[in-house]
């Protein structure tokens, strides 16, 4: 019983890590940028894997996306492959583990075929989510070293050769999301590990015994009752991105409760 | 069509306060922020300060921080503009003005004149 | 606060000329996560509110007429005039829309000679 909850339980768990590393993998607000210190300005921007957004007081925003390879930063390509990476070995490792599940029957599966896919999703939840966190780090580091860099920039004499203001970034929401939805894919595939180890079946040194009474016989064999609970997570499908077929996004976004103004 | 719709002229003592409405129409007034901007006789324009009708945050300029205060009314769908402490250098025709793209004004109150004399 | 100051104060200009006005800001309206500059021009007719005419510096408003034009970048820019019209006579303020507080030029008399 605690095998299957310990299953079901790192199943869980990685399925919500894996929804979140793909949301955060799509969220815009990978950067943003930094309002303290500085002056404050009517306009917001924020930078994410795949475009990069400005947010006017007016409500009105609008999104560009790098319709560039070659002119983007090793670092931002990278980070997008671990993003993948990480989904992508995530996928399979859920769709793995659903035939893993104890509570599942599938056939006449052997306990030791679902121990054995139960430590490959696990492992797969455990590289998924490692390539998850190492993005997202990667992303963090490479913020940080920028932003020391601008701030240098500011308090260095440039002259009237600057033509823009210093737009300095920082840690944007999707960063954190990130973070914690790999902790959780990691979490869930150590999980799976564990529930493994469970799954295995131990060789046993009897044979089934008979025991004869009279009037009527029973056979009675170890090893118990297979659960037949329909162990099932019934969670809606959310759209989490729209990537669209626009070549440029302008949307009037209307102020909302939360934005500034 | 957009249209804002200003109250009417009024004539006040130094160190009293005044309040302006300005009822907009034509479009959702929670989806635009109001922005108030004055103007002195024979002067140019002075931004005062905008509020986001949907939230109610406001944004003032620090030179009338403390004596302009802008709200909204949603059920009315009215923005007011309350200046206190006024003097004789407030005389002036106050405006509220829709932000649009670009925090531009796109669409503006006919004026309301506001005088100060004792 | 910004400071935007407008040259000349007042242009006179034969109908059929062209009329350019200078706007010049104390720090770069140039916004680098999109590249825009933040830069309104507006026309004011006496005794009516101000009329916006092209935003982002050289982004015409609907229904304006294609003989006004903006341009600059950073913290210089120009409204110009192609053709002068007897209507076109107004005040035109340049304002800064990035910075808080929003600050306006201090006009620019457009008269016939």
């Known amino acids: 019983m605690a095998v299957t909850a310990c299953q079901g339980l790192g199943f869980v768990v990685s399925l919500i890590g894996i929804a979140g590393i793909i949301a955060a993998t799509c969220m815009d607000q990978w950067s943003t940028q930094d309002l303290y210190n500085n002056p404050v300005t009517a306009v917001f921007n924020y930078q994410g894997l795949w475009r990069s957004c400005v947010r006017e007081s007016s409500g009105f925003t609008e999104c560009r996306g790098y319709f560039t390879l070659l002119g983007l930063p090793a670092m931002l390509q990278a980070v997008r492959a671990l993003m993948i990476v990480g989904i992508v070995l995530g996928a399979i490792g859920l769709l793995v583990s659903i035939f893993a599940l104890k509570c599942i029957r599938i056939g006449s599966m052997e306990d030791s075929a679902k121990a054995n896919m139960t430590l490959t999703s696990g492992i797969m939840f455990i590289v998924s989510g490692l390539c998850a966190i190492a993005g997202v780090s990667v992303f963090a580091n490479m913020l940080v070293t920028n932003f020391w860099m601008s701030t240098a920039n500011m308090y260095t004499g440039m002259g009237g050769m600057v033509q823009t203001v210093q737009t300095r970034y920082t840690f944007g929401a999707a960063l954190f999301v990130g973070w914690v939805a790999g902790g959780l894919t990691l979490i869930g595939g150590v999980m799976m590990c564990i529930a493994c180890r469970g799954l295995a079946p131990e060789e046993t040194n009897y044979k089934a015994v008979s025991y004869h009474a009279s009037g009527h016989s029973v056979a009675y064999k170890p090893g118990g009752f297979k659960a037949s609970t329909g162990f099932g997570s019934n969670t809606k499908n959310k759209k989490i991105y729209d990537g669209g077929a626009r070549t440029e996004d302008e949307v009037q976004s209307y102020p909302s409760k939360h934005d500034y103004v | 069509q957009v249209q804002l719709v200003q109250s009417g002229a009024e004539v006040k003592k130094p160190g009293s306060s005044v309040k302006v409405s300005c009822k907009p129409s034509?479009?959702?007034?929670?989806?635009?922020?109001i922005d108030w901007v004055r103007q002195a006789p024979g002067q140019g324009l002075e931004w005062m300060g905008g509020i986001n009708p949907g939230s109610g945050d406001t944004v003032y300029n620090e030179k009338f921080q403390g004596r302009v205060t802008i709200t909204a009314d949603e059920s009315t769908s009215t923005a007011y503009m309350e200046l206190s402490s006024l003097r004789s250098e407030d005389t002036a025709v106050y405006f509220c003005?829709?932000?649009?793209?670009?925090?531009?004004?796109?669409?503006w109150g006919q004026g309301t004149l506001v005088t100060v004399s004792s | 606060d910004i400071v935007m100051t407008q040259s000349p104060d007042s242009l006179a200009v034969s109908l059929g000329e062209r009329a350019t006005i200078n706007c010049k800001s104390s720090?770069?309206?140039?916004?680098?996560?999109?590249?825009?500059?933040?830069l309104t021009w507006y026309q004011q007719k006496p005794g009516q509110p101000p009329k916006l005419l092209i935003y982002?510096?050289?982004t015409r408003e609907s229904g304006v007429p294609d003989r006004f034009s903006g341009s600059g970048s950073g913290k210089d820019f120009t409204l110009t005039i192609s053709s002068l019209q007897a209507e076109d006579v107004a005040v035109y303020y340049c304002q800064n829309n990035y910075f808080y507080p929003l600050t306006f030029g201090g006009g620019t008399k457009v008269e016939i000679k």
């Open positions: 034509g479009y959702t007034f929670t989806n635009y922020l």
């Open positions: 003005a829709r932000r649009v793209r670009g925090n531009s004004f796109d669409s």
């Open positions: 982002w510096a050289s």
């Open positions: 720090q770069s309206l140039l916004n680098s996560g999109n590249q825009k500059n933040y």
